[in-house]
Amino acid sequence: RTRSGSQLDGGLVLFSHRGTLDGGFRFRLSDGEHTSPGHFFRVTAQKQVLLSLKGSQTLTVCPGSVQPLSSQTLRASSSAGTDPQLLLYRVVRGPQLGRLFHAQQDSTGEALVNFTQAEVYAGNILYEHEMPPEPFWEAHDTLELQLSSPPARDVAATLAVAVSFEAACPQRPSHLWKNKGLWVPEGQRARITVAALDASNLLASVPSPQRSEHDVLFQVTQFPSRGQLLVSEEPLHAGQPHFLQSQLAAGQLVYAHGGGGTQQDGFHFRAHLQGPAGASVAGPQTSEAFAITVRDVNERPPQPQASVPLRLTRGSRAPISRAQLSVVDPDSAPGEIEYEVQRAPHNGFLSLVGGGLGPVTRFTQADVDSGRLAFVANGSSVAGIFQLSMSDGASPPLPMSLAVDILPSAIEVQLRAPLEVPQALGRSSLSQQQLRVVSDREEPEAAYRLIQGPQYGHLLVGGRPTSAFSQFQIDQGEVVFAFTNSSSSHDHFRVLALARGVNASAVVNVTVRALLHVWAGGPWPQGATLRLDPTVLDAGELANRTDSVPRFRLLEGPRHGRVVRVPRARTEPGGSQLVEQFTQQDLEDGRLGLEVGRPEGRAPGPAGDSLTLELWAQGVPPAVASLDFATEPYNAARPYSVALLSVPEAARTEAGKPESSTPTGEPGPMASSPEPAVAKGGFLSFLEANMFS
């Protein structure tokens, strides 16, 4: 049975497997004139591997917390018992309400793109919910994943994430948007505002159009023992134990301390959603306690001091000193100043000498001062911040932060491409293609200093020469190289890059991109002279932009042939002259020819050649450009896409008729050659290229 190349290329020829796993078919190839000897196309069939997904595919996350994906959530397997390392998930659409990251990498910048089932089993794939500014009761997120493990067919999976205040959360004991407690000076009053107690997330369970007529009712179930609660100056008591979220929001709830000591106080309450005018609604409810800390009025609160980030390399350990954590507190001993970790980064943990191997969440200033507190870096290379709260036990806790920078062991400046400056502009912005610093990750905070300036130009930021700039400025397109001297087509400069305490140098090459249109067209005939005109080389746009006549200088080539100036008319004496320089005007006047030579010392056939030119114009830097072209033995039957000024002698002789030749010096007809009728790419082309000698 016969099949055509176009059928193969169109995917219309199918192989249907039946029988043994190894086999194939024999075939011959013919172009209508020639037939190749027989060939065998081997086919090996593989047993179909099927992927399957088990697990709930739902993840319940506490608001603002990090939750690992587990095998209960996501469990893939294959019919071939594939190693979990080879079961790959690709994140097609990431989460909207948080981020997915790897415990070991903690890519704070870039989203996790793929992970394996083995990493899920290890608990290394984490979902972190980011608290929105607006309160909510329950929010839903989805992750669209694609499970793949060649040769099995991919399987799409959706992981549903439910973020809910209803869930019991060890990290967040309150079900309310805020329940932070209150600090009040002894014997004084303090307003309890929504900054300390806020149940507006219960209200968020009501659709917004109806929300204004709903409220949250708080019922005090245990009153403060050392003070009194007042709403709009009216005391709350067993007979009137209620207040509303709307009153709280209006600043009407006050705690008045009765004096006589600084013991802890507080109250217990139930809170539930209520409908308009207090009617019943099926909304959330919670029972909680609100802590009130009474502090000595004479107490001077501790003053945190400026903190220097801790810097250390990946996987190492470094002590934390007063440079990182210190406070000024004249009436507290270092042992009385307590720190509590509110939120730890993913790049390591704090540990106390003699306090076991695990992470610590509470320590004192005395631990810092004595050098007992250290940070242990894990494999992550990402900077992180500890959110701490510090208190002397009598003043309200103050938020503090400790920044930890993980230093790379080495950095590399990646230079993907030289900087190309458009010829007519004479200036161009640097980008990540020219300068980008990587260590074990990208370094977006890198800074650069010029250690060897360019010879023919300047580096500018904001229009002013500069010798220092940042990666951020590069990424924003603010760093510009501008030629100040129009005598060279290239330049270079050397920079020293600094990222997270490590440096490296690199040379950036600058080249001028010629404003030149080059059209080589199809293959050109060997032994012929073809006209070089604006259809082949055109610097007309450069001429317009610079208001000058661009000049070309031949730097190199062609290897087989030469560029010549052709006589203006048949009557003009003398043959063609060798040319090393010419102008745009010469091209437009049709005064130039390219004699295409034959490669010597080998059988006639297709070949490649090129011209390298330097293009000059007034007031702009020169540029180097090349004209690459293919050549082939002259074929009289073929229409060429350029004007031929002469054809090879042999071809004229063979034709036998003088009128069949185009006389030297007279342009031939411009024939626009169609593409050769050869199938492009595909199976047939592969066979043609490889099986016919």
């Epitope: 409908g275 308009p276 019943s280 959330p284």
Partner: antibody, heavy 117, light 113 residues
Framework: QVQLVQSGAEVKRPGASMKVSCKAS????????IHWVRQAPGQGLEWMGW????????NYAQKFQGRVTMTRDTSTSTVYMELSSLRSEDTAVYYC??????????WGQGTLVTVSS | DIVMTQSPDSLTVSLGERTTINCKSS????????????LAWYQQKPGQPPKLLIY???TRESGVPDRFSGSGSGTDFTLTIDSLQPEDIATYYC?????????FGQGTRLEIK
């Protein structure tokens, strides 16, 4: 202490309108809903509707829809209830009541409205 | 609308006696989310406005004597007066505050034997 003082008794002709006022004192006026409840002679209590003095939002019992209008004046901490197209069966004592949640913790002294030709 | 039905309509009792008044709602007034029964009891004496005694079916309002107690859940509720005093002679109303329109029972009149 909390007080709700209502306007005095009125006699109205059938088809006329009446407007009873309820002035609040001793608490934050905008914090609490005001309800209107009426009681015909020798009869039980009948809820008419509520107004939220903070937002001005209202909710009326279906029976009075289209005939009743509740308004408030926050500058004088007063709530008004207007009932139009009066009939003899509208003869009743009209009470305003302050609600803490949806129960009525404080009541006005009542306003007797007599509808008679 | 939720219909509230009280029984009996009137009750003749002796002073010092224990008295119970029943109230039935046509549908449940229990909010299962917060486990509250949205039912209140009021006392009304002639020529006076009603006075709140009990809310949420069993919570006594401030200043109400502890001889008054409320019980029940869902649709069936009871007001109990432990030892009837002369000042307790009045008409008693139950009210659902579960959903609008808030509705009252027809009332139970207490008289002395």
């Amino acid at each position: 202490q909390v007080q709700l003082v209502q306007s005095g008794a009125e006699v109205k002709r059938p088809g006329a309108s009446m407007k009873v006022s309820c002035k609040a004192s001793g608490y934050t006026f905008t914090n609490y809903y005001i309800h209107w409840v009426r009681q015909a002679p020798g009869q039980g209590l009948e809820w008419m509707g509520w107004i939220n003095p903070n937002s001005g939002a209202t909710n009326y019992a279906q029976k009075f829809q289209g005939r009743v209008t509740m308004t408030r004046d926050t500058s004088t901490s007063t709530v008004y209830m207007e009932l139009s197209s009066l009939r003899s069966e509208d003869t009743a004592v009209y009470y305003c009541a302050k609600s803490w949640v949806s129960w009525f913790a404080s009541w006005g002294q009542g306003t007797l409205v007599t509808v008679s030709s | 609308d939720i219909v509230m039905t009280q029984s009996p309509d009137s009750l003749t009792v002796s002073l010092g006696e224990r008295t119970t008044i029943n109230c039935k709602s046509s549908q449940s007034v229990l909010n299962s989310k917060n486990n509250r029964n949205y039912l209140a009891w009021y006392q009304q004496k002639p020529g006076q406005p009603p006075k709140l005694l009990i809310y949420w079916a069993s919570t006594r309002e401030s200043g109400v004597p502890d001889r008054f107690s409320g019980s029940g859940s869902g649709t069936d509720f009871t007001l109990t007066i432990d030892s009837l005093q002369p000042e307790d002679i009045a008409t008693y109303y139950c009210q659902q505050h579960y959903s609008t329109p808030f509705t009252f029972g027809q009332g139970t009149r207490l008289e002395i034997k």
